[in-house]
């Protein structure tokens, strides 16, 4: 739940959600630093860093949901992302090890900032859900597969496979956030009307 008063203005809140998803779909915030830290920044390895189909809801799936269903799915998916991020963070090298390997501390900081960034977005999603619940016309909730458990780590044979799994997951996350941004951009001017 959000702390502090949520904005009561639909257009303001929608604008805030669009700004946040716009910033978060960007691979420089998560995927690229992860690739550099894990030593996967090689063209041949990057080819293997492609999302597993079905790991995240597709844009088509997201577009097919009602607004409430979309927010529920988004919230649940981001919940799973937070769990997986915690798992990835535990496996990252420590700051002093990075320095010794001549890698950029800033990459580690970017990865650490991902969690609060997602928490912030989720709080605004909560605010928008509240606002829609209080708006005049109810719309049937058509929830998606929800979390679809995006990232259950496959039993990896070794550390390298785990790194690739993390890479694929983050690739999928950014693609998902891009889709989320596109869906938000199609939302109408008022909470009572959809332009879908």
């Amino acid at each position: 739940a959000a702390i502090g008063s949520c904005s009561k203005e639909y257009r303001v809140l929608l604008g805030q959600l669009q700004k946040q998803t716009d910033l978060m779909q960007d691979t420089s915030r998560l995927l690229d630093p992860y690739i550099r830290i894990q030593g996967l920044d090689v063209p041949k390895l990057r080819e293997h860093c492609r999302e597993r189909p079905g790991a995240f809801p597709s844009e088509e799936t997201l577009r097919g949901l009602g607004r409430r269903g979309f927010l529920q799915t988004l919230n649940a998916t981001l919940g799973c992302v937070l769990h997986r991020l915690a798992d990835l963070e535990q496996r990252l090298p420590k700051a002093q090890d990075l320095e010794r390997s001549g890698l950029n501390i800033e990459d580690l900081e970017k990865l650490q900032m991902a969690r609060p960034n997602i928490l912030g977005l989720r709080n605004n999603i909560y605010c928008m859900a509240q606002l829609l619940d209080n708006s005049d016309t109810a719309e049937p909730t058509k929830a998606g597969r929800g979390a679809s458990q995006p990232p259950t780590p496959t039993p990896a044979s070794d550390a390298f496979q785990r790194k690739l799994e993390g890479c694929r997951f983050l690739h999928g996350y950014h693609r998902f956030m891009h889709s989320v941004g596109r869906v938000f951009s199609k939302w109408g001017e008022s909470p009572n009307r959809s332009r879908r």
Epitope: M113, P116, G120
Partner: antibody, heavy 119, light 113 residues
Framework: EVQLVQSGAEVKKPGESLKISCKGS????????ISWVRQMPGKGLEWMGI????????RYSPSFQGQVTISADKSISTAYLQWSSLKASDTAMYYC????????????WGQGTLVTVSS | DIVMTQSPDSLAVSLGERATINCKSS????????????LAWYQQKPGQPPKLLIY???TRESGVPDRFSGSGSGTDFTLTISSLQAEDVAVYYC?????????FGQGTKVEIK
């Protein structure tokens, strides 16, 4: 309406401690980061650091690391900037500003708190 | 740290004329994977806090008059006020958010000639 309201001007002596505040309203305080920015008299803007009030995750500019402490109390939607021992060179206007995602642009600013340090 | 350098330090422009401010970054703030420039512009009027005008180098913040426009890519950026109004007298700052620490240009003071 989004607002960041900062505490009033302060006049302090060198060596004294100080904590200034920035209260957010009109939006969910834990949906954003808060940055602090210094503006010395007649000078430009300097980024000091940033905090996510949801879990108090904090990052400082290397220039300000160890010089100030940034904190937040999400229960009262307030962020803080504090000094344990002020210097005359800390005399400046201090702004808090809201940041949608870190790092990014600063989309709403507080009115500023003028801190004067003089013996 | 990325160093931001603005030019000129100040300029005087007649009402209704065009004002152009330049900003140069010490390294590119263009991210190739999404082709976006991590650059913002702010306006600070005397005795007031800064106000966000433009982000992503060219996207106007909600409520900002369309006489303000941003352009440029990589390391070279421009803020243009197409027809200067009396209320535009202010100091203008560019800021990069490509990496931390966030850094600002030194500011450009715009006055009326």
């Amino acid at each position: 309406e989004v607002q960041l309201v900062q505490s009033g001007a302060e006049v302090k002596k060198p060596g004294e401690s100080l904590k200034i505040s920035c209260k957010g309203s009109g939006y969910s305080f834990t949906s954003y980061w808060i940055s602090w920015v210094r503006q010395m008299p007649g000078k430009g803007l300097e980024w000091m650091g940033i905090i996510y009030p949801g879990d108090s995750y904090t990052r400082y500019s290397p220039s300000f690391q160890g010089q100030v402490t940034i904190s937040a109390d999400k229960s009262i939607s307030t962020a803080y900037l504090q000094w344990s021992s002020l210097k005359a060179s800390d005399t400046a206007m201090y702004y808090c500003a809201r940041v949608p995602v870190s790092p990014a642009y600063l989309d709403y600013w507080g009115q500023g708190t003028l801190v004067t340090v003089s013996s | 740290d990325i160093v931001m350098t603005q030019s000129p330090d100040s300029l005087a422009v007649s009402l209704g004329e065009r004002a152009t401010i330049n900003c140069k970054s010490s390294q590119s703030v263009l991210y190739s994977s999404n082709n976006k420039n991590y650059l913002a512009w702010y306006q600070q009027k005397p005795g007031q806090p800064p106000k966000l005008l433009i982000y992503w180098a060219s996207t106007r913040e909600s409520g900002v008059p369309d006489r303000f426009s941003g352009s440029g890519s990589g390391t070279d950026f421009t803020l243009t006020i197409s027809s200067l109004q009396a209320e535009d007298v202010a100091v203008y700052y560019c800021q990069q958010y490509y990496s931390t620490p966030l850094t600002f240009g030194q500011g450009t003071k715009v006055e009326i000639k």
